[in-house]
């Protein structure tokens, strides 16, 4: 099968919706950055479609994306991170649609990890801690985190807490006794860089102690 688009193919292509969205991840692999794009319409026939980025690059004019199933991505050190790049969907040598995007405004941080919850009996609270790879990064260092927790039986009743540190204290009296809770965390850029929420961290599950009847306090687990 030829990679050329026949005229008929181009005419058909022009009827399609080639809307796409992208996100960048900075210093995702050492000093390498990544840029990931995908079509918003999952039914687009991507067989001969390619993505290309031009402008605001170091040493090169343009870079081509690699294709992995429905996802198009670049891993490179060559993003200037100043000014807008032109990202185009191409078939053959024809550009079907382009977007001018500043890669610093579409940053998706890496998901937080090592989420854990420790019960402090004396303080009657739970200390929630987690880690983020962004503490070691040169660019996207400042993040806002969204900690979400729920009682396991409450399907969609999530309580959200926004914080800029990686430590949160949950008061025991705010939680139901003798209940299983699920907690997770995600991050979003919060200073200079803009963009999207990261993926959620893996969930952590913890149980609250029962109430000690004589003191009115919960029993430790």
């Amino acid at each position: 099968e030829s990679g050329y688009a026949q005229n008929g193919d181009l005419e058909d292509a022009e009827l399609d919706d080639y809307s796409f969205s992208c996100y960048s991840q900075l210093e995702v692999n050492g000093s390498q950055h990544s840029l990931t794009c995908a079509f918003e319409d999952p039914d687009v026939n991507i067989t001969n479609l390619e993505f290309e980025i031009c402008g605001a690059l170091v040493e090169v004019k343009c870079l081509n994306f690699r294709k992995l199933q429905e996802i198009y991505f670049i891993e490179t050190k060559k993003f200037l991170l100043i000014g807008k790049s032109n990202i185009c969907v191409k078939v053959g040598e024809k550009s079907l649609t382009c977007k001018k995007i500043d890669l610093t405004t579409i940053v998706k941080p890496e998901a937080p990890f090592d989420l854990s919850v420790v019960y402090r009996e004396g303080a009657n609270d739970f200390v929630v801690t987690f880690n983020t790879s962004h503490l070691q990064k040169k660019y996207v260092k400042v993040l806002m985190h969204d900690v979400a927790y729920r009682q396991e039986k409450d399907e969609n009743k999530w309580t959200h807490v926004n914080l800029s540190s990686t430590k949160l204290t949950l008061l025991q009296r705010k939680l139901q006794p003798a209940a299983m809770y699920e907690i997770k965390v995600r991050s979003i850029p919060d200073h200079y860089f803009k963009g999207f929420w990261s993926e959620w961290s893996p969930s952590y599950y913890f149980r609250t102690p029962e109430i000690n009847n004589s003191s009115g306090e919960m029993d430790p687990i």
């Epitope: 099968e1 000093s31 040493e59 081509n64 690699r66 490179t76 060559k78």
Partner: antibody, heavy 119, light 107 residues
């Protein structure tokens, strides 16, 4: 201006190890790009051997992987090729070149060095 | 491995002729293709990258077209210095592979 220059012995005995060095000027091998070795047997086409990435990671062609090591010395701005257990089939002009990985080209090449495997 | 089938393996042409060399990839490689020119005793020289983009300092009589599996290098008006061997190369997947070459000779 980026320049690459291969060096090493022109004659290697069968079963021994071929060792070549590529000295780079005008660009640091630890700044960016992949740093490649390519060879061309007499009268034949080009064969990519492998690269060392600016970060130090390496990728080799599967057919030579068991015999190839590419390393670097950032203090001298050099990268090197070692090919063990050579035979006459390894007789070729060996080139070093910059590029690949996130770019689809080799833009700078060394002039090449001829290595003959013979007893 | 992705096979790069280059044709013809050799051709004879005159100064001023339009010359076309094709490269067929055994699977789709998008725009991950480069063309090189090699003269006897010299290293290859980059002509075209990303299938269609002209490398710096390369005369505009050279052009590249195609994407996916079928690629073409065209020399619009052959000059005396263009008699050489031409190679295509894919960077889409490891191992990176070259075509077998096309030798352009004087008729």
């Amino acid at each position: 201006q980026v320049q690459l220059q291969e060096s090493g012995p022109g004659l290697v005995k069968p079963s021994e190890t071929l060792s070549l060095t590529c000295t780079v000027s005008g660009y640091s091998v630890s700044t960016d790009y992949a740093w490649n070795w390519i060879r061309q047997p007499p009268g034949k086409g080009l064969e990519w051997i492998g690269y060392i990435f600016y970060s130090g990671s390496t990728t080799y062609t599967p057919s030579l992987k068991s015999r190839v090591t590419i390393s670097r010395d950032t203090s001298k701005n050099q990268f090197s090729l070692k090919l063990s257990s050579v035979t006459a089939a390894d007789t070729a002009v060996y080139y070093c070149a910059r590029g690949g990985y996130d770019v689809n080209y080799f833009d700078y090449w060394g002039q090449g060095t001829t290595v003959t495997v013979s007893s | 491995d992705i096979q790069m089938l280059q044709s013809p393996s050799s051709l004879s042409a005159s100064v001023g002729d339009r010359v076309t060399i094709t490269c067929l990839a055994s699977q789709t490689i998008g725009y991950w293709l480069a063309w090189y020119q090699q003269k006897p005793g010299k290293a290859p020289k980059l002509l075209i990258y990303a299938a269609t983009r002209l490398a710096d300092g390369v005369p505009s009589r050279f052009s590249g077209s195609g994407s996916g599996t079928m690629f073409t290098l065209t020399i619009s008006s052959l000059q005396p210095e263009d008699f050489a061997t031409y190679y295509c190369q894919q960077f889409f997947s490891y191992p990176w592979t070259f075509g077998g070459g096309t030798k352009v000779e004087i008729k």
